[in-house]
Structures are given as structure tokens and as C-alpha cells.
Interface confidence: low
């Protein structure tokens, strides 16, 4: 009869037993360490700064429209300013710039102030472009809207942009943009090398 | 330098319709990014803004004047206009034009001052 | 429509003296405000816009600050030339209003 509690017979070798008696504490060793790794690292990594891990983001509220002749739309960011923010990327006169590359989904929304569908529709065409706009050997296109009969239009779009690409936004048309905070915004996302 | 002159009738008689003219001069009303705005102050009181006009035509009134503003443009003369309908001694009040970056007022003209009398 | 009530009415200060007038705004309007200065029997003149920029032009004296509902303008050191009735105006979005005007006197 085997003993009670015990895992092992008296008559056999007791080989197993021994195996099974430092088996168990080293495995519940290495599951307490994996477990206090885990903790550490993800503490760790609460303590990095997004951008360090790859995770460049900003996300974007309108400063001013440019002065006369300048269809750009100027932007600012941080947290003293609400819900906006930059981790990785850089505002340079208003502009974005990009310190990473990778593939990034970039967002924007427009709404036009002081509009109606009757406005926009007998003032169009206003458009909305987004485009890589320096350094100029990279200049492109990236996404082209128009507002046809509405006041608001919003897009997003995957994208690769490389260190030092100055996105730029430019409004063209007659009509102005409103600065709420919810009506309009711009931002980045970078998703994978 | 940019300036902005107000003139038109300083007496108008109730329920009649009010018109002033703001001349530019020194720059151009169709300058990309500025609109045209009528303020005004009524006497001893703060300032009511009126609305706005984009060289183009775009206007836009405050919804407190409910219809009776008109704004209008003429481009060729480098002048933008108010219309006021129907009016009683409540619009009595010195009328300002103003450029409009957008959002606030930068510059403004001397001012006019109206009254509504029989 | 959003109100904008500004305080005092009016003050009466020394030449000298910081001077604080503030503005509140029903509803939150960010940064986007503008201060006039309108001196008797002149035209209103732009001060601070984006609630903390000066105009060119502008005495460094002058200062504003504030965002969401609450915003201030100071004079560090008041001035006799400083003798007029300030207003805010809102302008995140139509129709702009001002407020109902503070008047500034010397003791």
C-alpha cells in the first residue's frame, strides 16, 4: 500500500520521487520569477517614454490659419491644451514633422466655421490636402478632400513616412475652419516599421 | 498702411433701412484670409458684433438681428456694405467696420455714429 | 449662445498698481480670446489674442492669461495712458461676443 500523502511506493526505486521533489520547487521557482519578470518589465515599460518604443503618436488642435497667401493650417499640441499631445513627433512653425520611420496611419478632420450645407455648396470648391511637404525631394500628396456640400470631412490613411517628413495641411477655398477642439483635428499614428 | 473709413446718413428715420459703406484703403479687400466686419456701440454701452463678409460674398449676421442685415461687397470699389432694415431708436448706436483675421478684429475703423429719429 | 461676464465694472486704481480684470465665459472657449482697449471718445484697439498673445505694438505691461472659462488680462503697472474700458471677445465660434466691458479710472 502506498503511504499517505506520498506519491511514491516504498518498493519501488525511488527515483520519480526524488525527480518530482526538485522538479516542483524549481518549477514554481521559474513561475515566480516569470511572473516577477513580467511585473518588472511592464513597469518598466510604463516608465519609457512611448516614443522609445516605437510607438511615435500625436494627435493635433488648430492654432490659426496662415497669413495671406500661405494656405496652411497652423497646429498645436500638448497637455495644457486639452486633449492633444505629442510623443515622438515634432511641431515645427505649426507643421509636423516625423522622427521615426514606419508606416503611419495619419487622421484628419476638418469643419468648416460658420457654415451651412447652402455655404458650402455655392463657395466650392474648398478643399482640404495633406501632403509630405518637406524635405521637397519627398514632396507628395497624401490625401485630398473636398467639402462639396457638407461642412465637416474627416480621412485617414496608411502611409509610409520616413525621419524628417514635414506633413503639412492646406486649406484652400474661401472659407475658414473652426477651432473647436472636437470640430477639428489632425493627427498621426505610427503602426509598424 | 491698411485703414478702413465709415461713412453713410447719420439720422434715419424709424422703420426705415440703414446704410453705411466702409472704404479700404492702403490694401486690398480681397486679401486672402481677412474678413469684413460691422460692429457697433450703442451709446455709453459695450460693443455688439454684426457680422461678417469674405470678399468673395460670403456673409454671415448675427442671428440676433435676426433678417434685417445685409452685407454686401464691391470689390471694384475696394467697399463693403451694411444695410440694416427696418429700424427704431434701439439701433441709435455709433457703427464701426473692422478687418477680421478670421476670428478677432486687428483693425478697426473711427467709427460713425447713427441715430434713429423722427 | 456662449455669455462672456467680466469683473469688475469698473475699478479705480493708482498710478503704479497691478491691475487684474477678468473675464468668464459660459462655456468653455479654449484659448481663443481677444482684450480691447478703448480709450474715451477713441476706437477699440486689439490687445492680447489667443488669450496670453500681445499685438504688436502692445505694451509688455499688459498680460493675459486664462483657458477654458476663466481668463484674465493685467496691467503690471498702471499708467496714466492706461485710462480707458477694456473688452473680451470670444471668437471659437459665430456669433462673436464681447463682454459687457470693464472701466478703468486713476485714483
Known amino acids: 500500500m502506498p503511504e499517505e500523502g506520498s506519491g511514491c511506493s516504498v518498493r519501488r526505486r525511488p527515483y520519480g520521487c526524488v525527480l518530482r521533489a526538485a522538479l516542483v520547487p524549481l518549477v514554481a521557482g521559474l513561475v515566480i520569477c516569470l511572473v516577477v519578470c513580467i511585473q518588472r518589465f511592464a513597469q518598466a515599460q510604463q516608465q519609457l517614454p512611448l516614443e522609445s518604443l516605437g510607438w511615435d503618436v500625436a494627435e493635433l488642435q488648430l492654432n490659426h490659419t496662415g497669413p495671406q497667401q500661405d494656405p496652411r493650417l497652423y497646429w498645436q499640441g500638448g497637455p495644457a491644451l486639452g486633449r492633444s499631445f505629442l510623443h515622438g513627433p515634432e511641431l515645427d512653425k505649426g507643421q509636423l514633422r516625423i522622427h521615426r520611420d514606419g508606416i503611419y496611419m495619419v487622421h484628419i478632420q476638418v469643419t468648416l466655421a460658420i457654415c451651412s450645407s447652402t455655404t458650402a455648396s455655392r463657395h466650392h470648391p474648398t478643399t482640404l490636402a495633406v501632403g509630405i511637404c518637406s524635405p521637397a525631394s519627398r514632396s507628395i500628396s497624401l490625401l485630398r478632400l473636398s467639402f462639396h456640400q457638407g461642412c465637416t470631412i474627416a480621412s485617414q490613411r496608411l502611409t509610409p513616412l520616413a525621419r524628417g517628413d514635414t506633413l503639412c495641411t492646406n486649406l484652400t477655398g474661401t472659407l475658414l475652419p473652426s477651432r473647436n477642439t472636437d470640430e477639428t483635428f489632425f493627427g498621426v499614428q505610427w503602426v509598424r516599421p | 498702411q491698411v485703414q478702413l473709413q465709415e461713412s453713410g446718413p447719420g439720422l434715419v428715420k424709424p422703420s426705415q433701412t440703414l446704410s453705411l459703406t466702409c472704404t479700404v484703403s492702403?490694401?486690398?479687400?480681397?486679401?486672402?484670409?481677412?474678413?469684413w466686419s460691422w460692429i457697433r456701440q450703442h451709446p455709453g454701452k459695450g460693443l455688439e458684433w454684426i457680422g461678417y463678409?469674405?470678399?468673395?460674398?460670403?456673409?454671415y449676421h448675427n442671428p440676433s438681428l435676426k433678417s434685417r442685415v445685409t452685407i454686401s461687397v464691391d470689390t471694384s470699389k475696394n467697399q463693403f456694405s451694411l444695410r440694416l432694415s427696418s429700424v427704431t431708436a434701439a439701433d441709435t448706436a455709433v457703427y464701426y467696420c473692422?478687418?477680421?483675421?478670421?476670428?478677432?478684429?486687428?483693425?478697426w475703423g473711427r467709427g460713425t455714429l447713427v441715430t434713429v429719429s423722427s | 449662445d456662449i455669455q462672456m461676464t467680466q469683473s469688475p465694472s469698473s475699478l479705480s486704481a493708482s498710478v503704479g498698481d497691478r491691475v487684474t480684470i477678468t473675464c468668464r465665459a459660459s462655456?468653455?472657449?479654449?484659448?481663443?480670446l481677444a482684450w480691447y482697449q478703448q480709450k474715451p471718445g477713441k476706437v477699440p484697439k486689439l490687445l492680447i489674442y489667443?488669450?496670453?498673445t500681445l499685438h504688436s505694438g502692445v505694451p509688455s505691461r499688459f498680460s493675459g492669461s486664462g483657458s477654458g472659462t476663466d481668463f484674465t488680462l493685467t496691467i503690471s503697472s498702471l499708467q496714466p495712458e492706461d485710462v480707458a474700458t477694456y473688452y473680451c471677445?470670444?471668437?471659437?465660434?459665430?456669433?462673436?461676443?464681447f463682454g459687457q466691458g470693464t472701466k478703468v479710472e486713476i485714483k
Open positions: 489667443a488669450a496670453s
Open positions: 473692422a478687418r477680421d483675421f478670421g476670428w478677432y478684429f486687428d483693425l
Open positions: 492702403g490694401g486690398s479687400i480681397s486679401s486672402d484670409g481677412y474678413y
Open positions: 462655456q468653455g472657449i479654449s484659448n481663443y
Open positions: 471677445q470670444k471668437y471659437n465660434s459665430a456669433p462673436r461676443t
Open positions: 463678409m469674405y470678399y468673395s460674398g460670403i456673409t
